[in-house]
Every structure is written in structure tokens, then in C-alpha cells.
Interface confidence: medium
């Protein structure tokens, strides 16, 4: 029987900068009934805060509601892992709200061909942002990454869309069938997950770009 | 307004032992980890040793491990890094060094530094 | 260990140009848990201790002027002065604190022609 072997404070994430979560990987147990608290401090103060809700995240974890996070201040949190022989710190995590945000998928992927009669035809993309974040405050730019393949193929083509939520791909193979997915990304934080794939039958009389 | 002052330092012969001190004013000294960072006559920084909040946690560069020991007595606010067997290749002015957090993160404050000199 | 190497080691610049100084990590400093970079600059002028400029690789330590900037991520950062100034004469290091031993680039002499 041991003290508990050091804990790994691994992720925080936030999905909007209104609330965040984080996460550990507990040490070793020493072969004991160990229990886990997580306390921060925000930069510039000294007195500390226990997690305000070990639930919400689901286990190993610790999630900042609305009235425990703020944009504007720093945070710095350890671990402590504590049975009946000793306890363990984590090292500390600084934890900087406006870092670690990964928005949801975009939403409404709608895929069209569009065949003009005087321009060569295109595969139009669009999209709107996930709903939890609010582009309209200016606190945010997201920024856009289209992902396609035919159904068969193993590689994927990727575009950059930068802010807009509309993308024309010009480029594709006659009567084949695409997979085309979205993504989102803020400026300082980490990429959505991909949105579920959308299908597009491309015609046989669609002509590639030259 | 922070102030680190280190003393301790001078002439010693190769083998012998020092005991630097950095006398920390301006800040909770019991809230950060303080390290000692060195840097030879004409030459680079070199980081030796670094203690975080928890006093257990101590940290040395490989070219001391086993002969630098590290140490803080919060009450005193004063951080303390004792050298044995020295030789002549530990000649630097040596720094006590703030950091910006409880651990080690980025050195926001440095004292004046303080000489030591291995020679024979 | 992270090796840290910078470059040039030395440059001499005009009063008000633009300047740039690159530091190369041997690995990634980029912290995937917070989504920062562990790196720190500094600038040491003769006979002082040296003086915290930027951390996180992009954040200025206050009191630092905004002529002073830092940018990079994973193994490639810059530290630019936007104009330089007679008083940034010194010597420039790169500094990881992602892993011990924690390690400073040869550094950089910048003077002024």
C-alpha cells in the first residue's frame, strides 16, 4: 500500500468561452481508496477555489459554469489524489479561456449542383455556425476547413474557406458521388469535429474545370 | 516593487562547498517557485535549479544533480541553493530568478546575481 | 533535452527598422492540454540580469513596449521589434519551460550601424 501516484491534468476545453472543462488521468492508486480534488487560482490572487462542479464533465473532471469563467482572467489548477497513505499534487495547468475553445460542427451542411448556363458548373457549399457561438458579440472569428472525396476513394481534398460560410468547388469527377463535411476552428483555439457527411451525386454531364 | 537579492558568492577552491542565499521583498514569496539560473563570464544563461510552491518539488540541470541542493524557507522569504564539489566549470554569476506562477513558468523577476569563482 | 537554437547570433540593424530574431525548439513546446506554447524571450543588457519580454511565446509581459512582439507555435518562433529603438541594444534568448531541464538559445547580439 502506497501514497497515490501523480495525477495529469490532460485537456480543458471549452465549447464557447462561456464555460469550460477540464480533465485528469489519475496516478496510480497505491492499492487504496483514493480521492480527487482539483483547486485553482486565478493569476494575480493567492486564495484558492475548489472545482465547483466534479459532475457536468463526467468522471475525472471538472467543469466552470457560467459564473466560474471568465474571458478575461487566467486560471491555474492542480490535481490533489489523497488516500490514507499520502497524497499527490498534478503539476500546475494555466488555463487561458480564449485558448482552449472547440466549438461544436457547423450546422445545416447544404450541398447543391449548380449548373449555369454561360459558366462552367460548380458544387456549392454551405453552412452556419454552431449554435453556441455568437459571432455577433465580435468576441469571435471562426474560421472555415471543407473537407471532400468521392465515396471510394481514400483521400480527402481539403479547402480552406477562411470566415465565409459559403465555398464554390469547381474541380470535380463526373458521376461520382461526394462526401463533404465542414469544420470550424476560432482564431486561438482548436479545430471543431468534422459535421456528419453530407452526400452529393455529381451529374455525368458535369464538366471538369479545365 | 520585487527585489531579489542573492549573496553568498566568492572565491572557492575546486571540491569545495558555497551556500548561496536570495533574500526575496515585494511579493508573497510563499506563492511562486524561484529558481537559479547561471551564466559564465562572457557566455550564455544556463539553468541549475528551480523549487516549486511545494518545497518537495525540486528540479536540476544534469550538470549538478547530485552535488547542487535547492531550498526555500518561506517564513524567512529567502531561497537557498548549496553547492558542494564544485569545480571549475560552475564559474558564473549566478541568479535567483522569480517565476511568473507556483510552478515553473517563464522567469518574470531576476536578482543582480551573484559572482562565484572555482579556482585553485 | 529540448535544444534551443537561434538565429542569427548576431545582427546589427538601423534605428527604426524592423528586426527580427528566430528560435528553433528541438521539439514541439506547444502543450496540447492548454493549447499554449512554453516559451519565454528575453533581453539581457551589459551588466544586468536579464528582463522578461514575452511568455506563451506571444504574450507581453506588462511594462514591456508594444514595439516588442512575439509569434510561433509548436517548433518555430519570432521575436520581432517593430522599430527599432538606440535602448534595444542587448543580447536576445529563447527559453522553454515546457520541460526540464529548462533551456535558453545561445542567444542573439543585436547592435545598431
Known amino acids: 500500500q502506497l501514497p497515490p501516484g501523480k495525477p495529469e491534468i490532460f485537456k480543458c476545453r471549452s465549447p464557447n468561452k462561456e464555460t469550460f472543462t477540464c480533465w485528469w488521468r489519475p496516478g496510480t492508486d497505491g492499492g487504496l481508496p483514493t480521492n480527487y480534488s482539483l483547486t485553482y487560482h486565478r493569476e494575480g490572487e493567492t486564495l484558492m477555489h475548489e472545482c465547483p462542479d466534479y459532475i457536468t464533465g463526467g468522471p475525472n473532471s471538472c467543469h466552470f459554469g457560467k459564473q466560474y469563467t471568465s474571458m478575461w482572467r487566467t486560471y491555474i489548477m492542480m490535481v490533489n489524489a489523497t488516500n490514507q497513505m499520502g497524497s499527490s499534487f498534478s503539476d500546475e495547468l494555466y488555463v487561458d479561456v480564449t485558448y482552449i475553445v472547440q466549438p461544436d460542427p457547423p450546422l445545416e451542411l447544404a450541398v447543391e449542383v449548380k449548373q449555369p448556363e454561360d459558366r462552367k458548373p460548380y458544387l456549392w457549399i454551405k453552412w452556419s455556425p454552431p449554435t453556441l457561438i455568437d459571432l455577433k458579440t465580435g468576441w469571435f472569428t471562426l474560421l472555415y476547413e471543407i473537407r471532400l472525396k468521392p465515396e471510394k476513394a481514400a483521400e480527402w481534398e481539403i479547402h480552406f474557406a477562411g470566415q465565409q460560410t459559403e465555398f464554390k468547388i469547381l474541380s470535380l469527377h463526373p458521376g461520382q458521388k461526394y462526401l463533404v463535411q465542414v469544420r470550424c476552428k476560432p482564431d486561438h483555439g482548436y479545430w471543431s469535429a468534422w459535421s456528419p457527411a453530407t452526400f452529393i451525386q455529381i451529374p455525368s454531364d458535369f464538366t471538369m474545370n479545365d | 516593487e520585487v527585489q531579489l537579492l542573492e549573496s553568498g558568492g566568492g572565491l572557492v577552491q575546486p571540491g569545495g562547498t558555497l551556500r548561496l542565499s536570495c533574500a526575496a521583498s515585494g511579493f508573497t514569496f510563499s506563492a511562486y517557485a524561484m529558481s537559479w539560473v547561471r551564466q559564465a563570464p562572457g557566455k550564455g544563461l544556463e539553468w541549475v535549479s528551480s523549487i516549486n510552491v511545494r518545497a518537495g518539488d525540486t528540479y536540476y540541470a544534469d550538470s549538478v544533480k547530485g552535488r547542487f541542493t535547492i531550498s526555500r524557507d518561506n517564513s524567512k522569504n529567502t531561497l537557498f541553493l548549496l553547492m558542494n564539489s564544485l569545480r571549475a566549470e560552475d564559474t558564473a554569476a549566478y541568479y535567483c530568478a522569480k517565476a511568473r506562477y507556483s510552478s515553473n513558468w517563464g522567469f518574470d523577476f531576476w536578482g543582480q546575481g551573484t559572482l562565484v569563482t572555482v579556482s585553485s | 533535452d529540448i535544444v534551443m537554437t537561434q538565429s542569427p547570433d548576431s545582427l546589427t540593424v538601423s534605428l527604426g527598422a524592423r528586426t527580427t530574431i528566430n528560435c528553433q525548439s528541438s521539439?514541439?513546446?506547444?502543450?496540447?492540454?492548454?493549447?499554449?506554447?512554453?516559451l519565454a524571450w528575453y533581453q539581457q543588457k551589459p551588466g544586468l540580469p536579464p528582463k522578461l519580454l514575452i511568455y506563451?511565446?506571444?504574450t507581453r509581459e506588462s511594462g514591456v513596449p508594444d514595439r516588442f512582439s512575439g509569434s510561433g507555435s509548436g517548433t518555430d518562433f519570432t521575436l520581432t521589434i517593430s522599430s527599432l529603438q538606440a535602448e534595444d541594444v542587448a543580447i536576445y534568448y529563447c527559453q522553454q519551460y515546457s520541460n526540464t531541464p529548462y533551456t535558453f538559445g545561445q542567444g542573439t547580439k543585436l547592435e545598431i550601424n
Open positions: 506563451w511565446s506571444s
Open positions: 521539439q514541439t513546446i506547444l502543450h496540447s492540454s492548454n493549447n499554449h506554447n512554453y
